[in-house]
Amino acid sequence: VPRWRQQWSGPGTTKRFPETVLARCVKYTEIHPEMRHVDCQSVWDAFKGAFISKHPCNITEEDYQPLMKLGTQTVPCNKILLWSRIKDLAHQFTQVQRDMFTLEDTLLGYLADDLTWCGEFNTSKINYQSCPDWRKDCSNNPVSVFWKTVSRRFAEAACDVVHVMLNGSRSKIFDKNSTFGSVEVHNLQPEKVQTLEAWVIHGGREDSRDLCQDPTIKELESIISKRNIQFSCKNIYRPDKFLQCVKNPEDSSCTSEI
């Protein structure tokens, strides 16, 4: 008789999840000499321990504490790039501008990027059928709590000028309900962070509007200013050219506005 299994609204755990996490850990520690000391089996055990045998709607930040300790990594505080709804371009940028870091350029972010996972209360099984959806089921699910925890800590670490890449093609360029809007903005430390600089990425080829005047950007400016952090904003009209100019800054076409 098949065991009754909780059906959640979201997709199940990514197939080959344990193997993927372990392989990513090994790859990351091989590429980054400063993380060579990390024991990837211990990392996987700590990751697994955060959600296995626990109700997937009752996960806490404390559940991830052992993993957070094992993944400790000093990030240059003045080289942090946050992003919202424009992950691919942010990652393309840090692949070229190697001294800047998104969360997914850290070990913990790299391990979990684009993956889904959850377990079941009182069994050691991973649920590959379904996992809780943040909206339809519960917010304290393994994936959401993980990203909330690491995003908060990543924002806490930032100093000097912090950059954020925002998607100018979205109806809400700045969304208060995004991870950036609900977690990272509120965990920037005014004693350390002088300025938040937003880069608004344009989507349309002929879009010459100043999206820094968008009402949601003004809302972001207001939130940041109230936290005693300065705010600045730049339009990136041509993201393709922007990336090209990061690669080849001495190119003659890179002196004009991008």
Partner: nanobody, 116 residues
Framework: QVQLQESGGGLVQPGGSLRLSCAAS????????MGWYRQADGKQRELVAE???????NYANSVKGRFTISRDNAENTVSLQMNSLKPEDTAVYYC??????????WGQGTQVTVSS
């Protein structure tokens, strides 16, 4: 850069008490998880107790019910109250400050000796 300085170590009889204190520099120390570790002669350093930035505590099984960790974010201190001390608690005790993306820092250590 975080700097940590332990104090309060010394010689105490079995069953006695000591209070270790760790003074820390740095305006954002409240963001760090703070811990006490110990290292006995010829042994590896081991976690004694930790308190997260959110205030959650965790203790080694060997000290549960005897030791209490606390923090004062306003004063930038973390303390370890040690009661019912045993000879096997003899070690150098180290203060630790750790943040996932800001790194880990250690004090120089303070000697605790439990002996009659």
């Amino acid at each position: 850069q975080v700097q940590l300085q332990e104090s309060g170590g010394g010689l105490v009889q079995p069953g006695g008490s000591l209070r270790l204190s760790c003074a820390a520099s740095g305006s954002t120390l409240r963001l760090y998880d703070m811990g006490w570790y110990r290292q006995a002669d010829g042994k590896q350093r081991e976690l004694v107790a930790e308190i997260t930035s959110g205030g959650s505590t965790n203790y080694a099984n060997s000290v549960k019910g005897r030791f209490t960790i606390s923090r004062d974010n306003a004063e930038n201190t973390v303390s370890l109250q040690m009661n019912s001390l045993k000879p096997e608690d003899t070690a150098v005790y180290y203060c630790n400050a750790e943040h996932t993306f800001m790194g880990a820092y250690w004090g120089q250590g303070t000697q605790v000796t439990v002996s009659s």
